[in-house]
């Protein structure tokens, strides 16, 4: 029997390689049963996660899951970093895994690494 707790399904250790200047949507998959929870995004700064108050967000509904989306229009170089979504559910705070954005500045787009090159960089492979 499926749990009726809220679940946030950001993939563990997930990464996105994106270009500055492009639009990008960061999705937080949310599973809930009855009432849609209040969900927020934050950006990691060391061990604290700073709430993103003034950013454009939206909901997208699919058959078995919903997505709380953080919009980057456009992506800026300082959007580089790790993000987490969290939900308030029955006075509990549920936090997702973090997901990391690797932003390549358009100025150096000609030297933009491929996905495989990104994966081969030791500072991305290891923590």
């Amino acid at each position: 029997k499926e749990s009726c707790d809220v679940q946030l399904y950001i993939k563990r250790q997930s990464e996105h390689s994106i270009l500055a200047g492009d639009p990008f949507e960061l999705e937080c998959p949310v599973k809930y049963c009855a009432n849609r929870p209040h969900v927020t995004w934050c950006k990691l700064n060391g061990t604290t996660c700073v709430k993103l108050e003034d950013r454009q967000t939206s909901w997208k509904e699919e058959k078995n899951i919903s997505f709380f989306i953080l919009h980057f229009e456009p992506v800026l170089p300082n959007d580089n970093g790790s993000y987490r979504c969290s939900a308030n559910f029955q006075s509990n705070l549920i936090e997702s895994h973090s997901t990391t954005l690797y932003v390549t500045d358009v100025k150096s787009a000609s030297e933009r690494p491929s996905k495989d090159e990104m994966a081969s960089r030791p500072w991305l492979l290891y923590r």
Epitope: K11, E15, N64, I65, K115, Y126, R127
Partner: antibody, heavy 119, light 112 residues
Framework: QVQLVQSGAEVKKPGASVKLSCKAS????????AHWVRQAPGQGLEWIGR????????KYDPKFQGRATMTADTASNTAYLELSSLRSEDTAVYYC????????????WGQGTLVTVSS | DIVMTQTPLSLSVTPGQPASISCKSS???????????LNWFQQRPGQSPRRLMH???KLDSGVPDRFSGSGSGTDFTLKISRVEAEDVGVYYC?????????FGQGTKLEIK
């Protein structure tokens, strides 16, 4: 229920390439990772790497970096592993593995594909 | 890479008796999210592996409760309280905290 159906056995010559497929059903392919694990005859399990089908992001064991290429097609819910410059030591059963909502916990295993490399 | 060392590499157990497999990692497997990504897999002869235990001690669906997992940091143990004939096979520990993910070399369980 979750099902991972892998392509049939392959026999290849040293130096050749092989491309294996793994068709997923019973879950949302884009919301999970697809991993590849291999097992040489009578040997243990070896993690090759994983792909995020949603964006194509890959992670490889450095041992396979450059020789293995993982791809995914979300339209057909299929993950692929291509291994190039094959040598006899690549003779193994190759498993594709999915996890529950990207937990990276290797929840569901395919039936495996035997690749034999022989001259 | 994180090295996973299993002991013993093989064991022969009388049905009804307990069995224990140790797995040691070369580095603590405690992740920054507070979880320890250590799984145990069983591979019966001629079959694909299946997961028995995840996050050290969480029993997977359909796995008999005679199996239990324990440990923290770098030292982990899989225990079978009463071995049965269907438990024959190879058992692997696996870490998913650091890339590249790595398996132990396997422990072969036979029935006396």
């Amino acid at each position: 229920q979750v099902q991972l159906v892998q392509s049939g056995a392959e026999v290849k010559k040293p130096g050749a390439s092989v491309k294996l497929s793994c068709k997923a059903s019973g879950y949302n392919f884009k919301h999970t990772y697809a991993h590849w694990v291999r097992q040489a005859p009578g040997q243990g399990l070896e993690w090759i790497g994983r792909i995020d089908p949603a964006n194509g992001n890959t992670k490889y064991d450095p041992k396979f970096q450059g020789r293995a290429t993982m791809t995914a097609d979300t339209a057909s819910n299929t993950a692929y592993l291509e291994l190039s410059s094959l040598r006899s030591e690549d003779t193994a059963v190759y498993y594709c593995v999915a996890d529950h909502y990207g937990s990276s916990l290797l929840d569901y295993w395919g039936q495996g594909t035997l690749v034999t490399v022989s001259s | 890479d994180i090295v996973m060392t299993q002991t013993p590499l093989s064991l022969s157990v009388t049905p009804g008796q307990p069995a224990s497999i140790s797995c040691k990692s070369s580095q603590s497997l405690l992740d920054s999210d507070g979880k320890t990504y250590l799984n145990w897999f069983q591979q019966r002869p001629g079959q694909s592996p299946r997961r028995l235990m995840h996050l050290v001690s969480k029993l997977d669906s359909g796995v008999p409760d005679r199996f239990s997992g324990s440990g923290s940091g770098t030292d982990f143990t899989l225990k079978i309280s009463r071995v049965e004939a269907e438990d024959v096979g190879v058992y692997y520990c696996w870490q998913g905290t650091y890339f590249p993910y790595t398996f132990g070399q396997g422990t072969k369980l036979e029935i006396k």
